[in-house]
Amino acid sequence: TLNSVLNSNAIKNLPPPLGGAAGHPGSAVSAAPGILYPGGNKYQTIDNYQPYPCAEDEECGTDEYCASPTRGGDAGVQICLACRKRRKRCMRHAMCCPGNYCKNGICVSSDQNNFRGEIEETITESFGNDHSTLDGYSRRTTLSSKMYHSKGQEGSVCLRSSDCATGLCCARHFWSKICKPVLKEGQVCTKHRRKGSHGLEIFQRCYCGEGLSCRIQKDHHQASNSSRLHTCQRH
């Protein structure tokens, strides 16, 4: 299971963010940690595939995008659909499978040098990256290093974790993605346990670092299993 959490990796002792509400189709939820939005199977491998409702591409898995299941169908009913392979029709990058991007309505290989220009300017100037992953696994092929100057530092906007410098991952922050530190041993992490219980989140921590996994903290006894504290621990 991949790890993420509502709170930003950087938000440790701050009170819940105030003054902002995330508007979801048909709902109004406060932008406070602890609230999960409906939908999505973005964090788990699905053994028996079921269509998951979604509102954004990033609520879906690495090889999926969010759209209406029927051509010209009701825009309010969207599910995670399988990504489109090379030479298939597309409307945006997220529709194309990893290693490809959408150019002139067709999925083409992102290995080509012109992909850099297609994403616009530099990676650090991009922002509403609704189609990028919430984890360390790259949704889109890493861009050739000659195409842009440097890896994103902490606080830089990113498309995927490979855009960030070593020790950082690309994690959701409000309506964007920014480079945040990969979690160290003993730091709090979140493990999503149930399918469909982990919709689009406002904040997100990175995954645990190399050699670590997100497990229930020993000696942390609480009444409810679901509220037990998870931390990054050695394998």
Epitope: S8, A10, G23, I119, F127, Q153, G155, V157
Partner: antibody, heavy 115, light 108 residues
Framework: QVQLVESGGGLVQPGGSLRLSCAAS????????MTWVRQAPGKGLEWVSG????????YYADSVKGRFTISRDNSKNTLYLQMNSLRAEDTAVYYC????????WGQGTLVTVSS | DIVLTQSPATLSLSPGERATLSCRAS???????LAWYQQKPGQAPRLLIY???NRATGVPARFSGSGSGTDFTLTISSLEPEDFAVYYC?????????FGQGTKVEIN
Amino acid sequence: QVQLVESGGGLVQPGGSLRLSCAASGFTFNNYGMTWVRQAPGKGLEWVSGISGSGSYTYYADSVKGRFTISRDNSKNTLYLQMNSLRAEDTAVYYCARTIYMDYWGQGTLVTVSS
Amino acid sequence: DIVLTQSPATLSLSPGERATLSCRASQNLFSPYLAWYQQKPGQAPRLLIYGASNRATGVPARFSGSGSGTDFTLTISSLEPEDFAVYYCQQYMTLPLTFGQGTKVEIN
């Protein structure tokens, strides 16, 4: 090159409505979230609202929540701000911008709320 | 809300001089989620720095950002005539996104 052009500003009476538009070009619009920021005459900058790339998720400052609605039409590469129940204190130049640390800005459109 | 306080309100300097602008947050930002903008009269703001210390595309090397926690600084190593403007800091740590009240850098 990236261009953002706002329109729709003007003079409106308190309690009235206006709809601002921001036409975007030079980048793949639906890949990017967008933001509205305003600046009252002679004052500083104030964040108003933000919207994700697909338009499914929106965020508002407390001062405008319930009165303003941000939206976008990705087929037209256009961002909108519907402003209802306008107050004198909403008088400002309204800018649309791209990114959470706004890397591109429009030239702004002036909204004047006065009787 | 996180309040950003910029100081000084006005900085009177001559071309070639070094300008140091301060931005203090009312709460620890924990991470470098801070940006700096330049605004000239009648114009939209322009992004200079993001992530506290990263220069935006096309911004001259004389502009640099530093700081962490609650104290952040924008430094202009040697003022050029076109640098006289108002400078704003902005945090994107938490909602609402907030800006400082601005520092005006004027010609002495």
